[in-house]
C-alpha cells in the first residue's frame, strides 16, 4: 500500500525503494552524509591512476516538489544528481587549474550515487485531510565507479540508483534469511 513512485512537477517518475543496500563499512565509519567527498589527491599521472578515489565527477542540485495524486509537498526538496563523465580530480573543468576534459581510453568511469539520505516531506492534500508524512530517498553524494567489459550484471546494477526495484504495488521482501535478516532490513542505509 505504500507509495511506489514520486512525481515532480515535470511529471518525471522517480521510483522509490523500501530497501537499499547497506553502505560498506568504510563509508559508515569515515563519511557522514553531510560531506560529498568526490575524489582525493590528484594522481601522479592523469592517465595511469588505478585508484577510483582519485577520480571525481560533478554533483548538480535541483529542486522539485513531491506529489502523489492530488497531494503535494508543503516545501520542495533539493536533490543531488550525479552527472557527467569521471576524470582525475585535478582535470575536471570545474577544478582549480582547469585542464582539458579527460577522456578515458581504456576502462570507463561512471558517475554514480555514493551515499543516500532520507528527507521527510509533509504532503498537503485537498479536502482538508490531515497532511501525510512520507520519506523520500535522495542522493547525498556521488562517486566514480570503474566499469570494464568484464563487469558482470550484478556489478552493473550499481549504476542505476533504482536498479533492483521491487515490482509495482508489491512490498520488498527481505534480502536474506540469515540470523541478521531482520536487522539488515531495519538497519539498511538511505
Amino acid at each position: 500500500q505504500g507509495w511506489q513512485a514520486f512525481k515532480n512537477d515535470a511529471t518525471e517518475i522517480i521510483p522509490e525503494l523500501g530497501e537499499y543496500p547497506e553502505p560498506p563499512p568504510e563509508l559508515e565509519n569515515n563519511k557522514t552524509m553531510n560531506r560529498a567527498e568526490n575524489g582525493g589527491r590528484p594522481p601522479h599521472h592523469p592517465f595511469e591512476t588505478k585508484d577510483v578515489s582519485e577520480y571525481s565527477c560533478r554533483e548538480l542540485h535541483f529542486t522539485r516538489y513531491v506529489t502523489d495524486g492530488p497531494c503535494r509537498s508543503a516545501k520542495p526538496v533539493t536533490e543531488l544528481v550525479c552527472s557527467g563523465q569521471c576524470g582525475p580530480a585535478r582535470l575536471l573543468p570545474n577544478a582549480i587549474g582547469r585542464g582539458k576534459w579527460w577522456r578515458p581510453s581504456g576502462p570507463d568511469f561512471r558517475c554514480i550515487p555514493d551515499r543516500y539520505r532520507a528527507q521527510r516531506v509533509q504532503l498537503l492534500c485537498p479536502g482538508g485531510e490531515a497532511p501525510r508524512a512520507r520519506k523520500v530517498r535522495l542522493v547525498a553524494s556521488c562517486k566514480c565507479k570503474r566499469l570494464t567489459r568484464f563487469h558482470n550484471q550484478s556489478e552493473l546494477k550499481d549504476f542505476g540508483t533504482e536498479a533492483a526495484r521491487p515490482q509495482k504495488g508489491r512490498k520488498p521482501r527481505p534480502r536474506a534469511r540469515s540470523a541478521k535478516a531482520n536487522q539488515a532490513e531495519l538497519e539498511n542505509a538511505y
Epitope: 523500501g18 553531510n34 528527507q119 521527510r120 508524512a133 523520500v136 547525498a140 531495519l186 542505509a189 538511505y190
Partner: antibody
Framework: EVQLVQSGAEVKKPGASVKVSCKAS????????MNWVRQAPGQRLEWMGD????????TYNHKFKGRVTITRDTSASTAYMELSSLRSEDTAVYYC??????????????WGQGTTVTVSS | DIQLTQSPSFLSASVGDRVTITCRAS???????LNWYQQKPGKAPKLLIY???NLASGVPSRFSGSGSGTEFTLTISSLQPEDFATYYC?????????FGGGTKVEIK
C-alpha cells in the same frame, strides 16, 4: 551497538523551561531521523516531533503550539528537546527514539532510556 | 488528528494462550505506516512490528501483525512469561504521529 543515552531527571517549576539531551552512538548520527515521544503517568505515548540531523529539518506536533524546540549538535552526535512554559500536565517521561532507515516506514527502532521531568510548584 | 483505539485495554491471559489485540483508526491508514511496540514497566518502548506485519530485529516469531485500512491486529500465538507487558500501536501516515491507548496483558 546502537545506544541513545539521555540526560538525567529534572524538576521544574510551572512556567519554566526544560532541555533534555539524547547522545547517540554506534551509528552515523546524521543518517537517521530522531523523534521525541513523551508519556505522562498512566497515559499513552505522545509524539512531540522529530529532526533530520542531516539538515536540521524539524517537524512538530501542533498540540505543543510552539512550546517545543528540537535541535541537534552533529559534532557531539546529540539531539535536544526543549519544552517551554511548563505546566503540571507536562510531568512525564520524555524519550528520544531513532527512526529506522527503511524508507517506507516511520517506525522507531531504538529508544533512549527516558528522562523524567516533574513540573511542580 | 488520527485517533487510534485499542481493544481490549486490559487483557488477562495464561502462558500458552493465543492473544489478539486490535487497533482501530479513525481514518484509513496506509499499512506501511502502522507499527506496534511493547513496553514493560519503567522501561522504554521496544519496536515489535513495523509496516503492519514485519517483525523487528530479535522479535520472536510468535508475534505477528496483520490488517489494513482502519483495523489492524497484533497476535501472540503462544503467550510466554516475558510477553506480559503493555502493547501500543502507532501510525505515522498522517501528521502528527499518534499512538493507541495501549493494551495491558497481565497474567491470569
Amino acid at each position: 551497538e546502537v545506544q541513545l543515552v539521555q540526560s538525567g531527571a529534572e524538576v521544574k517549576k510551572p512556567g519554566a523551561s526544560v532541555k533534555v539531551s539524547c547522545k547517540a552512538s554506534g551509528y552515523t548520527f546524521t543518517d537517521y531521523y530522531m523523534n521525541w515521544v513523551r508519556q505522562a503517568p498512566g497515559q499513552r505515548l505522545e509524539w512531540m516531533g522529530d529532526i533530520n540531523p542531516y539538515n536540521d529539518d524539524t517537524t512538530y506536533n501542533h498540540k505543543f503550539k510552539g512550546r517545543v524546540t528540537i535541535t541537534r549538535d552533529t559534532s557531539a552526535s546529540t539531539a535536544y528537546m526543549e519544552l517551554s512554559s511548563l505546566r503540571s500536565e507536562d510531568t512525564a517521561v520524555y524519550y528520544c527514539a531513532r527512526e529506522t532507515a527503511v524508507i517506507t516506514t516511520n517506525a522507531m527502532d531504538y529508544w533512549g532510556q527516558g528522562t523524567t521531568v516533574t513540573v511542580s510548584s | 488528528d488520527i485517533q487510534l483505539t485499542q481493544s481490549p485495554s486490559f487483557l488477562s491471559a495464561s502462558v500458552g494462550d493465543r492473544v489478539t489485540i486490535t487497533c482501530r483508526a479513525s481514518s484509513s491508514v496506509t499499512s506501511s505506516y502502522l507499527n506496534w511496540y511493547q513496553q514493560k514497566p519503567g522501561k522504554a518502548p521496544k519496536l515489535l512490528i513495523y509496516s503492519t506485519s514485519n517483525l523487528a530485529s530479535g522479535v520472536p516469531s510468535r508475534f505477528s501483525g496483520s490488517g489494513s485500512g482502519t483495523e489492524f491486529t497484533l497476535t501472540i500465538s503462544s503467550l510466554q512469561p516475558e510477553d506480559f507487558a503493555t502493547y501500543y500501536c502507532q501510525q505515522y501516515d498522517f501528521f502528527p504521529s499518534t499512538f493507541g491507548g495501549g493494551t495491558k496483558v497481565e497474567i491470569k
